[in-house]
């Protein structure tokens, strides 16, 4: 991704900028943005970034708040790149089954599953 | 989802069935299926289930292997339901920022980020 800093550092910096600019960002009291009901965040990246787009269009730009939205757009680029890597490599059934087993195992242990 | 057992139990059972039917599933030696390169599984659910569809269409059905694919289709239904919940609720900016902060926090600590 076109950034001098690694993605992990970019995420950390973005979290800090989010705290700094919170007051400015919540200034629009009538704005409503879709918020996922669950915490399986990776399933909702598209909606989260649509929400960020809505917020950006309603926020007075200038100073480091621009840096915040620039960072968020770089994070989106990174995630889009990861999504591309979901289907780039065509492998044999054996490898697919190993990955499927891993996926189900992760669902089993790490996903937030409602009964 | 239309199943008598909770999703968590469904996932466990599916993992067991996957082990049981491995030999049958890998019978097709020429079949190639996209396998994600990374371990951010939730980003790749669409591709994973497309792969499952490809595998199902190439597998001789009958007995408990049908149960395996039935379970996988119920898991897909559950995930599709979760994806619907990404944009069902329109909330104030404050709530959206809380969720965004949580999302970035999870990226920071739990995602598999390449440098």
């Amino acid at each position: 991704i076109p950034t001098e800093i690694p993605t992990s550092a970019l995420v950390k910096e973005t979290l800090a900028l989010l705290s700094t600019h919170r007051t400015l960002l919540i200034a629009n009291e009538t704005l409503r943005i879709p918020v996922p009901v669950h915490k399986n965040h990776q399933l909702c990246t598209e909606e989260i970034f649509q929400g960020i787009g809505t917020l950006e269009s309603q926020t007075v730009q200038g100073g480091t708040v621009e840096r915040l939205f620039k960072n968020l757009s770089l994070i989106k680029k990174y995630i889009d790149g990861q999504k591309k890597k979901c289907a780039e490599e065509r492998r044999r059934v054996n490898q697919f089954l190993d990955y499927l087993q891993e996926f189900l195992g992760v669902m089993n242990t790490e996903w937030i599953i409602e009964s | 989802i239309p199943t008598e057992i909770p999703t968590s139990a469904l996932v466990k059972e599916t993992l067991a069935l996957l082990s049981t039917h491995r030999t049958l599933l890998i019978a097709n030696e020429t079949l190639r299926i996209p396998v994600p390169v990374h371990k951010n599984h939730q980003l790749c659910t669409e591709e994973i289930f497309q792969g499952i569809g490809t595998l199902e269409s190439q597998t001789v059905q009958g007995g408990t292997v049908e149960r395996l694919f039935k379970n996988l289709s119920l898991i897909k239904k559950y995930i599709d339901g979760q994806k619907k919940k990404c944009a069902e609720e329109r909330r104030r900016v404050n709530q959206f920022l809380d969720y965004l902060q949580e999302f970035l926090g999870v990226m920071n600590t739990e995602w598999i980020i390449e440098s």
Partner: antibody, heavy 119, light 107 residues
Framework: QVQLVQSGAEVKKPGASVKVSCKAS????????INWVRQAPGQGLEWIGY????????RYNQKFKGRATLTVDKSTSTAYMELSSLRSEDTAVYYC????????????WGQGTLVTVSS | DIQMTQSPSSLSASVGDRVTITCKAS??????LSWIQQKPGKAPKTLIH???RLIDGVPSRFSGSGSGQDFTLTISSLQPEDFATYYC?????????FGQGTKVEIK
């Protein structure tokens, strides 16, 4: 930087077992599979199997199934390869190697551990 | 198991020579092949993956080509540090298998 550091040389008697360690550093241990490869003196390379530290799942070359056991200790970012019922033909240098991605090429190799089986 | 047949098993060449090593798979392995260099007493080092992708830090005189069953490693201008044994590895299917190696010696 990314490194795999293996345990020192071992001398074992036929019928015994050996456990070789491979300590990972410089990256998140659970993100990459660890493969094990061996090389008998003056011979080529042979794949033993891989372990996925993310879920402890391992897969073996049929030739070693039942004799090789791959494990990990996530708390110390260490992978282990145990080989039992040793025979003289198991004398070899054993390497651990990291998968770049899921079932990809080996991007980082350990320095190797010589295991000598001799009565 | 997929058999990997490498040729030649050894070759003598001079500094500056162009060297070609081939590897043939017993079945289609797509492009899931890497080339590995090993110097005496040292750990192996991967040079090329996915048949033709050079790994970061590997000199550009190394190149790979091929797909399906036939693959080639080329060293465009042999350097003193390139004298070593080269192996191909298929990581298309389990068990992963290596070629028997090609020893590149000084003429």
């Amino acid at each position: 930087q990314v490194q795999l550091v293996q345990s020192g040389a071992e001398v074992k008697k036929p019928g015994a077992s050996v456990k070789v360690s491979c300590k990972a550093s410089g990256y998140t241990f659970t993100n990459h599979h660890i493969n094990w490869v061996r090389q008998a003196p003056g011979q080529g390379l042979e794949w033993i199997g891989y372990i996925n530290p993310y879920n402890d799942y391992s897969r073996y070359n049929q030739k070693f199934k039942g004799r090789a056991t791959l494990t990990v200790d996530k708390s110390t970012s260490t992978a282990y390869m145990e080989l039992s019922s040793l025979r003289s033909e198991d004398t070899a240098v054993y390497y651990c190697a990291r998968d770049y991605g899921n079932f990809w090429y080996f991007d980082v190799w350990g320095q190797g551990t010589l295991v000598t089986v001799s009565s | 198991d997929i058999q990997m047949t490498q040729s030649p098993s050894s070759l003598s060449a001079s500094v500056g020579d162009r060297v070609t090593i081939t590897c043939k798979a017993s079945q289609d392995i797509n492009s899931y092949l890497s080339w590995i260099q090993q110097k005496p007493g040292k750990a192996p080092k991967t040079l090329i993956h996915r048949a033709d992708r050079l790994i970061d830090g590997v000199p550009s005189r190394f190149s790979g080509s091929g797909s399906g069953q036939d693959f080639t490693l080329t060293i465009s201008s042999l350097q003193p540090e390139d004298f070593a044994t080269y192996y191909c590895l298929q990581y298309d299917d389990f068990p992963y298998t290596f070629g028997q190696g090609t020893k590149v010696e000084i003429k």
